[in-house]
């Protein structure tokens, strides 16, 4: 059953150019694999709290503990990474707080900034003191397990010294690591004793061994790379947005809708309108009009700006977002006041989420 009647044909062509929406950056909690993580839901006066991960309900299990406003993840794994939300259900409304969990080691073995001064890792020896290879900076080699999100860059480092200066080669899963073994190859920076792989993919998972050797000896060190994959999900909208607003006749107002979606989202701003003096069609469904949608001729679709408003602009505005997987929508109300009344954004009054599901 359709939930509304469109007042006019709203052809959605031309489609929007591709955009990767990750506009709103929620707080990020980082944990290393195997660690425990505890997050407190930062919402007040919560009668009942429910949790989701990547838009899917999260229940307790042998590693996930939900106690009051706390979420505990024991022995975190890269699979625990994702977009989490806690929703506080109250008597009259509900509110959601989003946060990211990233279960991963540092993306590189040692910080990227080290490359600027990394020459210090290239130790020159007095030519008389012959010496087998040795590690010069073991702190940069402590983290052996690297869990990295797909498409990120990975850098492994094995800073070493010796005399004569040792050479470095890399193995993957115990075999010679060749450029043709991965799309885009890899970079070796001998000056910094590093291996760099850009835009990692799942097939990059495995053990990477640096072998450092000269005529007096050989040493090696192995890193394990795990590439964390994403799962596609329906769009997720930041709770409390768009927010209710008020303005005087002739004033301007802006509604904002924050979208989380890896897959290409299509954003629509819709308003309940009247046709022939009626808000509902013969089928009993409300008349709706698409005011703005993402596309080539549209500026930032996450923002709906209304200028020089009239009393007729008052009413409910819906932000509706769709990707190829599913949809989500939330709405807000615009109150238009007579000229003599001072407007104020009604921060306290947020429309409760109204998902078309």
């Amino acid at each position: 059953r359709p939930s509304f009647s469109l007042v006019e044909d709203t052809t959605l062509e031309p489609e929007e150019p591709p955009t990767k929406y990750q506009i709103s950056q929620p707080e990020v909690y980082v944990a290393a694999p195997g660690e425990s993580l505890e997050v407190r839901c930062l919402l007040k006066d919560a009668a009942v709290i429910s949790w989701t991960k990547d838009g899917v309900h999260l229940g307790p299990n042998n590693r996930t503990v939900l106690i009051g406003e706390y979420l505990q993840i024991k022995g975190a794994t890269p699979r625990d990474s994702g977009l989490y939300a806690c929703t506080a259900s109250r008597t009259v409304d509900s509110e959601t707080w989003y946060f990211m969990v990233n279960v991963t080691d540092a993306i590189s073995s040692g910080d990227d900034e080290d490359d600027t001064d990394g020459a210090e890792d290239f130790v020159s020896e007095n030519s008389n003191n012959k010496r087998a290879p040795y590690w010069t900076n073991t702190e940069k080699m402590e983290k052996r397990l690297h869990a990295v999100p797909a498409a990120n860059t990975v850098k492994f480092r094995c800073p070493a010294g010796g005399n004569p200066m040792p050479t470095m080669r890399w193995l993957k899963n115990g075999k010679e690591f060749k450029q043709e073994h991965r799309i885009g190859g890899y970079k070796v920076r001998n000056q910094h004793w590093s291996l760099i792989m850009e835009s990692v993919v799942p097939s990059d998972k495995g053990n990477y061994t640096c072998v450092v050797e000269n005529e007096y000896g050989s040493i090696n060190h192995t890193y394990h790379l795990d590439v964390v994959e994403r799962s596609p999900h329906r769009p997720i909208l930041q709770a409390g947005l768009p927010a209710n607003a008020s303005t005087v006749v002739g004033g301007d107002v802006e509604f904002v809708c924050k979208v989380y979606s890896d897959a290409q989202p299509h954003i629509q701003w819709i308003k309940h309108v009247e046709k022939n003096g009626s808000k509902y069609g013969p089928d009993g469904l409300p008349y709706l009009k698409v005011l703005k949608h993402s596309g080539i001729n549209s500026s930032n679709a996450e923002v709906l700006a209304l200028f020089n408003v009239t009393e007729a602009d008052a009413g409910e505005y819906i932000c509706k977002v769709s990707n190829y997987i599913g949809q989500a929508n939330q709405s807000a109300w615009l109150t238009v006041l007579p000229k003599q009344q001072a407007p104020g954004r009604e921060k306290e009054i947020t429309a409760s989420p109204d998902y078309l599901e």
């Epitope: 359709p2 591709p18 993919v201 290409q264």
Partner: antibody
């Protein structure tokens, strides 16, 4: 587990219509788009359109607009694809798809 | 509409060899999706969001690329990998597929 079970094969005359059904189970039917894709014999895949059962929103390929109608029955978790004014080049296997799962396909043969 | 061109149309290789399948879009897309299809079967989602393997897809498969050029790579072919592979874009309506690359045993 997720399952999409489609109706059986059909033989149709040119100019007539066909209605293919796709019964979904194992997930929340109203929360995901149901897409329809067809494949002519020995040919590639062609996206036709989709429906969002939660509010009956539809999205069609321009090529099929006016000739295809996609509907959904929430009570039975079933999606339907009706193609009218059939011609011989519409002979194909028609698939329903929930982004990560596909139905087994329905062969529609258009022949006089 | 966005036209996806796959190359080669047919790729003849032996088990154990490396396979590289290409998909080029007529205009930029944000992600590419890949499907595997065997004779008499429905297509199976294989790679989503350019580089993520679908459930049950072996680690020897990897996807990469950006903008208009995307690649599906099979590091070492197994007998069960021989099939037709289609790329698809979900960036704009109509959501088009490539014409397919048939991976056959040499």
């Amino acid at each position: 587990q997720v399952q999409l079970v489609q109706s059986g094969a059909e033989v149709k005359k040119p100019g007539s219509s066909v209605k293919v059904s796709c019964k979904a189970s194992g997930y929340t039917f109203t929360s995901y788009w149901m897409h329809w894709v067809r494949q002519a014999p020995g040919q590639g895949l062609e996206w036709m359109g989709a429906i969002y059962p939660g509010n009956s929103d539809t999205d069609y390929s321009q090529k099929f607009k006016g000739r295809v109608t996609i509907t959904a029955d929430e009570s039975t978790s079933t999606a339907y694809m009706e193609l009218s004014s059939l011609r011989s080049e519409d002979t194909a296997v028609y698939y329903c798809s929930k982004f990560d799962y596909w139905g087994q396909g329905t062969l529609v043969t258009v022949s006089s | 509409e966005i036209v996806l061109t796959q190359s080669p149309a047919t790729l003849s290789l032996s088990p154990g060899e490396r396979a590289t399948l290409s998909c080029r879009a007529s205009s930029s897309v944000n992600y590419m999706y890949w499907y595997q299809q065997k004779p008499g079967q429905a297509p199976r989602p294989w790679i989503y969001l350019t580089s993520n393997r679908a459930t049950g897809v072996p680690a020897r498969f990897s996807g990469s690329g950006s903008g208009t050029d995307y690649t599906l790579t099979i590091s070492s072919l197994e007998p069960e990998d021989f099939a037709v592979y289609y790329c698809q874009q979900w960036s704009s309506n109509p959501y088009t597929f490539g014409q397919g690359t048939k991976l056959e045993i040499k």
